[in-house]
């Protein structure tokens, strides 16, 4: 046969040869010819490449900048990247989690509905009827308005969705 | 398009050293391949002596034992053989050869 | 070393029939990539060799398609479909998986 126009999966065409590419964590020394194998050398410390690749420098390992908040969630090898999240508290301000940013507090009349991780916010919804939320918090749902009859009690003042209703003593001239 | 071309003395005598350049031309001997020397003893087969890789890293025949050395000169595109402590048997035709593109081969007689 | 047997050692063909020729390794020259490397050369006379036939069956460029290469492992054949005068001349098998690398003895193409 003539020499190939199209290569199988995991090799690569150059110079009419079909040559092995260089696996996972590997990276490209020397092309193959017509007498020799493709040539490849692992990625050195702190250095990573994730495919089947013909490149002839590898990745640096992310770079998580404790300046930004960022710490290590998952240490890289040579063939994946270093995994980065945000210290306690806050969380990262995209999908590649280059930067952090302190989670956002729900405002009174508000409550959280999803408490934030290191990679999503806060996520927070307004109190309903008969839910109030007094405090500005990263953690605390909207809690129901106390129920004045269990204790015997009536209702005083009415709640709000930032005040909890006021149980007063029932009126005994109505008894 | 990738020439080789072997130079060297004809005659070398007995106990002596033997020393051959290649100089190539078209291609890098730095950029890939292996480059070889390969000699032909008159009326007989091929002999494979060794190689100099494009990294400047050996392989020789152990046939040739330790009297044998390749090298490299970079500046000049040029790659070398040295045989040391040569006999009658060492009398051939060298060529050296990137195995897809040959030297045209030199004569090299051991004789006193 | 892989010691490489070739057979006929001399070969007479009628121009225009096909010819054959066989070489044999002492240990597989598949590599664990699967790939084999295995050539085949041409020598005319008071000429270099000239590759032929690269990696089993791949013919090198500017190679007449009535050249192919075929086999596996330990077993490899040259077969010339239609043998031209130009053909005469003594073929070679040379394997490069393996250090040494090591041809083989040759097979000399005559016309009857």
């Known amino acids: 046969p003539e020499p190939p126009t199209a290569c199988r999966e995991k090799q690569y065409l150059i110079n009419s040869q079909c040559c092995s590419l260089c696996q996972p964590g590997q990276k490209l020394v020397s092309d193959c010819t017509e007498f020799t194998e493709t040539e490849c050398l692992p990625c050195g410390e702190s250095e990573f490449l994730d495919t089947w690749n013909r490149e002839t420098h590898c990745h640096q390992h992310k770079y998580c900048d404790p300046n930004l908040g960022l710490r290590v969630q998952q240490k890289g090898t040579s063939e994946t990247d270093t995994i980065c999240t945000c210290e306690e508290g806050w969380h990262c301000t995209s999908e590649a989690c280059e930067s952090c940013v302190l989670h956002r507090s729900c405002s009174p009349g508000f409550g959280v509905k999803q408490i934030a991780t290191g990679v999503s916010d806060t996520i927070c919804e307004p109190c309903p009827v008969g839910f109030f939320s007094n405090v500005s918090s990263a953690f605390e749902k909207c809690h129901p308005w106390t129920s004045c009859e269990t204790k015997d009690l009536v209702v005083q003042q009415a709640g709000t969705n930032k005040t909890d209703v006021v149980c007063g003593p029932q009126d005994r001239l109505r008894a | 398009q990738v020439q080789l071309q072997e130079s060297g003395p004809g005659l070398v005598k007995p106990s002596e050293t033997l020393s051959l350049t290649c100089t190539v031309s078209?291609?890098?001997?730095?950029?890939?391949?292996?480059w070889n020397w390969i000699r032909q003893p008159p009326g007989k087969g091929l002999e494979w002596m060794g190689y100099?890789?494009?990294?400047?890293?050996?392989n020789y025949n152990p046939s040739l034992k330790n009297r044998i050395t390749i090298s490299r000169d970079t500046s000049k595109n040029q790659f070398s053989l040295k045989l040391s402590s040569v006999t009658a048997a060492d009398t051939a035709v060298y060529y050296c050869?990137?195995?897809?593109?040959w030297g045209q081969g030199t004569l090299v007689t051991v004789s006193s | 070393d892989a010691v490489m047997t070739q057979s006929p050692l001399s070969l007479p063909v009628t121009l225009g029939e096909p010819a054959s020729i066989s070489c044999r390794s002492s240990?597989?020259?598949?590599?664990?990539?699967?790939?084999?490397?295995l050539n085949w050369f041409q020598q005319k006379p008071g000429q270099s060799p000239r590759l032929l036939i690269y990696?089993?069956?791949n013919r090198f460029s500017g190679v007449p398609d009535r050249f192919s290469g075929s086999g596996s492992g330990t077993d490899f054949t040259l077969k010339i479909s239609r043998v031209e005068a130009e053909d005469v001349g003594v073929y070679y098998c040379?394997?490069?998986?393996?250090?040494?690398?090591?041809f083989g003895q040759g097979t000399k193409l005559e016309i009857k």
């Open positions: 050869a990137r195995l897809d593109y």
């Open positions: 078209g291609y890098s001997i730095t950029s890939n391949y292996y």
């Open positions: 100099i890789r494009y990294d400047g890293s050996n």
């Open positions: 240990q597989s020259l598949e590599n664990t990539n699967g790939n084999t490397f």
């Open positions: 990696r089993v069956s």
């Open positions: 040379l394997q490069v998986t393996h250090v040494p690398f090591t």
